[in-house]
């Protein structure tokens, strides 16, 4: 084995060495029929046409034609690994979830790290939030904590999610990333200020996946064995220490090693440097929620740690690389609605929206039986229900068990102990406008009290360096929002933009072809 190469580079050599004692397998078709010749098609004579009967060729080609599945509409580029969660502190007074049952308990986990906006071949070192999703394989079924590396998000109402993502992705005509789209949306929705400020700070480009924190971000509900509930947030803090990339290093790596994050994670695990995160909860009682200065379910806000301190729970440890990327990482499906008894949703609107969106996109991307795929299968629980059939039904389809409920034949019975926590709601049913639910207080605290002078300078430089490519009328809207956070924030960004704009004058008028018209007026006149 070449000494200078890393485990990721030597994967095939390693695979060969592991099988050194074995004879090579017999090559087969998908149906298991042995193949005699895999290098030449069957033709009529050496220069003649192919025969349809060449099933070795058609079997291979037909499968190849269907290799690609739709990439994730967000979080398409990612890295995955496996390991365990170990309980180190007792939180059974808050939650009856089996995953927290006793100190020392270990639960297998799968984790996927990702960027958000880029396609599956995009660079790992872009300025973008990072997905940090954890699947816990518990005895009460899977718990999917579908988190990010920030405790907040750009929006608080899920109806905006498709538009927000469209604004981050490619222009529908040019198929280019479009700063006008990005900053137009952000400037029209100032609830994005908190996440935008975090994103353009030093933490906006983590150094790989091992050196960043994770957050469940949403507010959840924990329920104990007595049926008592509290609200909670989940945090997982890196034991490797926070490390970020400079703008220059990130740009260099995106050219030299766009898969930097995947490679770093794979090599760390392959060399026994198992990354770990300390897992915490924040707890808020229902009474505290009443007096919290903000909506405690607002995804654009954090809960101050001083008032809601981090309570240690356990450790997440990653100690196994995927055996096959497609099978275990591309096909893994995280779904926030997978919550075992003891963990429930709060009224967080974004979480509520995700409870629908995630399983819906998985059914599209992987098929309605995506939970039969081994990496998604709740293998530590016994699945027994009245769901049957459908494309790619992979197990025994629950044999001859009755497929209707109720029944008189001893088929699966409901468990009253798994009933959801009941809560009283009353209020007007309508579309509540949350656009102005205090978009500045926490951003102001972040800018004034959290960042030092150097960090504020870099934040403003990073923002201006991106915002400069948007039209001037959009720049003005954005600067107005930053000024509302703090006059210095806006004026520093404006000063940098003035420099950029002096060097590169802009057309302040946004011209576009009206929808339904494929020809500009001038071209029509020439017809």
């Amino acid at each position: 084995m070449a000494d200078s190469r890393d485990p990721a580079s030597d994967q095939m050599q390693h695979w060969k060495e592991q099988r050194a004692a074995q004879k090579a397998d017999v090559l087969t078709t998908g149906a298991g029929n042995p193949v005699g010749d895999k290098l030449n098609v069957i033709t009529v004579g050496p220069r003649g046409p192919l025969l349809v009967q060449d099933v070795v060729f058609t079997d291979e080609m037909a499968h190849f034609d269907r290799e690609r599945i739709p990439e994730r509409v967000v979080h398409a580029k990612g890295a995955g690994a496996f390991g365990y969660f170990e309980v180190t502190h007792d939180i059974t007074k808050y939650s009856k979830a089996k995953v927290f049952e006793h100190i020392g308990k270990k639960t297998p986990i799968a984790v996927r790290f990702s960027t958000v906006a880029g396609e599956s071949g995009s660079a790992d070192t872009v300025r973008d939030p990072r997905g940090f999703a954890v699947k816990f394989y518990t005895e009460d079924g899977n718990w999917d904590l579908v988190g990010n590396n920030t405790p907040i998000f750009f929006i608080r109402d899920p109806i905006l999610f498709p538009s927000f993502i469209h604004s981050q992705k490619r222009n529908p005509q040019t198929h280019l990333k479009d700063p006008d789209m990005v900053w137009d949306f952000w400037s029209l929705r100032p609830e994005s200020l908190h996440q935008v400020s975090f994103l353009f700070s030093d933490r906006g480009i983590p150094d790989g996946h091992r050196h960043m924190n994770g957050y469940g971000s949403h507010t959840f509900k924990l329920v104990n064995a007595n049926g008592e509930a509290v609200y909670c947030k989940f945090h997982y803090k890196t034991d490797q220490g926070i490390k970020n990339l400079s703008v220059e290093d990130a740009a260099r790596l995106s050219q030299e090693d766009p898969d930097y994050g995947i490679r770093d994670l794979f090599n760390a695990i392959a060399t026994g440097k198992y990354p770990s995160w300390t897992f915490y909860i924040q707890v808020m009682t229902f009474n505290q929620a009443e007096t919290f200065p903000f909506n405690p379910f607002d995804l654009t806000k954090v809960w101050p740690h001083k008032d809601y301190p981090l309570i240690p729970v356990g450790k997440l440890v990653l100690n196994r690389n995927p055996v096959n990327y497609f099978a275990e990482v591309e096909q893994i499906a995280f779904d926030p609605s997978n919550m075992p008894p003891g963990i429930e949703a709060s009224p967080d609107k974004m979480l509520q929206g995700r409870l629908f969106a995630y399983p819906d996109t998985h059914r599209h991307r992987l098929g309605p039986n995506y939970l039969h795929i081994p990496v998604n299968c709740p293998y530590r629980a016994r699945v027994a229900n009245y769901q049957r059939d459908g494309p790619m039904c992979m197990q025994d389809n629950q044999g001859g068990a009755p497929n209707y409920y109720p029944n008189s034949f001893g088929a699966p019975e409901q468990q009253p102990s798994a009933l959801e926590h009941s809560i009283q709601y009353s209020g007007e049913v309508r579309r509540f406008n949350t656009a102005n639910d205090d978009n500045v207080t926490q951003v102001r605290a972040f800018y004034v009290n959290v960042l030092n002078e150097e960090q504020r300078k870099r934040l403003c430089e990073n923002i201006a360096g991106h915002l400069k490519d948007a039209q001037i009328f959009i720049q003005k809207k954005a600067v107005k929002n930053f000024t509302e956070v703090h006059p210095d924030y806006g004026s520093h960004i404006q000063a940098l933009l003035d420099k950029y704009n002096a060097e590169k004058p802009k057309n302040a008028i946004h011209t576009f072809v009206q929808s339904g018209s494929h020809l500009a007026a001038r071209e029509k006149a020439n017809l």
Epitope: V440, T441, R444, A445, V448, H486
Partner: nanobody, 122 residues
């Protein structure tokens, strides 16, 4: 260091109104949250209302619909308009300001005023 001074307390009949004011000695522009607390004789201090630097307000259930908190970051003042006052509103009212810092807002500086007496009695 921020000094807070309350004013506007006094004796008022049930059903009447009062307006409390809190003046700060320094800029409150970036102070995360300001609040009014009250303490009735022999009872614990309780939160009445809060207002964030961005203007989000919240009220204790006992005063919702009767009290209105407001804040003027330019004038460094906070007010509490109290309407439909009841005898159980009798207490010393304190102005409070809390400023958070650190990632996760894990530490804070807390400032209190000396308090102003409100008595609701016929």
């Amino acid at each position: 260091q921020v000094q807070l001074v309350e004013s506007g307390g006094g004796l008022v009949q049930p059903g009447g109104s009062l307006r409390l004011s809190c003046a700060a000695s320094a800029s409150i522009f970036s102070i995360y949250v300001m609040a009014w607390y009250r303490q009735a004789p022999g009872k614990q201090r309780e939160l009445v209302a809060t207002v964030t630097s961005g203007g989000a307000t919240n009220y204790a259930n006992s005063v919702k619909g009767r009290f209105t908190i407001s804040r003027d970051n330019a004038k460094n003042t906070m007010d509490l308009q109290m309407n439909s006052l009841k005898p159980e509103d009798t207490a010393v009212y304190y102005c409070n300001a809390e400023d958070y810092y650190d990632y996760g807002l894990s530490r804070s500086k807390i400032y209190w005023g000396q308090g102003t007496q409100v008595t609701v009695s016929s």
